[in-house]
């Protein structure tokens, strides 16, 4: 069979380097006084998203409906990817972490052009919406770098609430920092593969 394809996205060389690279870029942006949020991301990174237990996140998106699968992906199936766009957080999160000068890195997550993951805090759900920029606050998540090459995504609009897995679906989960900081159901892995 013949096929030909390539994609045009800027991303850091590897997962191990990305946080440090972003901190440097972000720090330079801060020194120059550039305003990032809502204008343009510091960097973008294309990655497949999986849970702590290595289940894949698949985005079944049509014009009028969508479903987000959390599942053991079949061997021959290519993993879906999300475009993570990194921004400077204007507000410190409820927890100190992966930032510079007390600020945080925020991300938006897009599985396809013009669509972004959004937090619905009333329904405690994670939704996909077609948006125009500037994106609403519900599309921004504070990024936390956890151990074992894992990350977690905290709602900008509701500190202490994270994207997590519940009943094989993505959901919003409130985390008690004193007890569940390392809770596996809010840990995700990013992979270039």
């Amino acid at each position: 069979m013949h096929h030909h394809h390539h994609h045009h996205h800027h991303h850091a060389a590897g997962l191990n380097d990305i946080f440090e690279a972003q901190k440097i870029e972000w720090h330079e942006a801060a020194i120059e006084g550039r305003s990032i949020t809502g204008i343009s991301p510091i960097t973008e990174y294309l990655a497949s998203l999986s849970t702590y237990n290595d289940q894949s996140i698949t985005f079944a998106l049509e014009d009028e409906s969508y479903e987000i699968y959390v599942e053991d992906l079949k061997k021959d199936k290519k993993k879906d990817k999300v475009l993570l766009s990194y921004y400077e957080s204007q507000h410190p999160s409820s927890e100190s972490g992966d930032g510079v000068d007390g600020k945080m890195l925020m991300v938006t997550l897009s599985p396809t052009k013009d669509f972004w993951l959004q937090a619905n805090n009333k329904e405690h759900s994670v939704e996909l919406h077609k948006c125009e920029k500037p994106l609403p606050d519900q599309a921004f998540f504070v990024l936390h770098n956890r151990s074992f090459n894992c990350v977690s995504f905290e709602c900008k609009t509701d500190p202490g609430v994270f994207i997590g897995v519940k009943d094989n679906h993505l959901a919003l989960i409130k985390v008690d920092y004193s007890e569940n900081l390392g809770s596996e159901n809010i840990l995700f892995k990013l992979s270039e593969i």
Partner: antibody, heavy 126, light 106 residues
């Protein structure tokens, strides 16, 4: 309502060329990978070619590789199949098919073929 | 090239269950889809991702896939289910179809 309308079929001599078109409506055309599938008279379905991103991701079945070219014009919501060096075995009804789901940043075809056009008939004969 | 094998024909009495198989190497490692095609009409997707039904497809259509075989099951078969049925998979960004099975409702 998703609609796919093929055109451009007809009778052509062996070695000749045809260009098929598929006019799409009722959905965001640029967001979906598209394919051509054919069916020879009295035979089964045969996938011919697919396209994801505009011009950058194209895929072909071995029997048509080097002879057929798939393309799309997102501004016109239209899918094309340029068929050159046609052979008798290319005689078939050609269907335009849309992937069920929108394209993902991973690229490629999402599969399966969720929506089909009514088909256009191509006859290659001298 | 990857080959999917289906029985040429299956006969079933109204109200009974029809099962159509689709065999291929390590079929269970792929996601199977099934298409219904009535004479003179375009194919219609009836099952995708092994077991899922698109909206508008009756509940009597179901699917499974493991090992080397995917199966389409029509429970309580009706006369309107008489058609050709094709299985399909995606193999490295190329589509592959089975040869088709003609379901006859006696």
């Amino acid at each position: 309502e998703v609609q796919l309308l093929e055109s451009g079929g007809g009778l052509v001599q062996p070695g000749g060329s045809l260009r098929l078109s598929c006019a799409a409506s009722g959905f965001t055309f640029s967001s979906y990978a598209m394919s051509w599938v054919r069916q020879a008279p009295g035979k089964g379905l045969e996938w011919v070619s697919g396209i994801a991103d505009d011009f950058t991701s194209t895929y072909y079945a071995d029997p048509v590789k080097g002879r057929f070219t798939i393309s799309r014009d997102n501004s016109k919501n239209t899918l094309y199949l340029q068929m050159n060096s046609l052979r008798a075995e290319d005689t078939a009804v050609y269907y335009c098919a849309r992937d069920l789901w929108m394209m993902n940043y991973a690229g490629g075809l999402r599969y399966p073929f969720g929506y089909w056009g009514q088909g256009t008939t191509v006859t290659v004969s001298s | 090239s990857y080959v999917l094998t289906q029985p040429p024909s299956v006969s079933v009495s109204p109200g009974q269950t029809a099962s159509i198989t689709c065999s291929g190497e390590r079929m269970g490692d792929k996601y199977a889809a099934w298409y219904q095609q009535k004479p003179g009409q375009s194919p219609v997707l009836v099952i995708y991702r092994d077991t899922k039904r698109p909206s508008g497809i009756p509940e009597r259509f179901s699917g499974s896939n493991s090992g080397n075989t995917a199966t389409l099951t029509i429970s309580g078969t009706q006369a309107i289910d008489e058609a050709d049925y094709y299985c399909g998979v995606l193999k490295q960004d190329t589509g592959v179809f089975g040869g088709g099975t003609k379901v006859t409702v006696l």
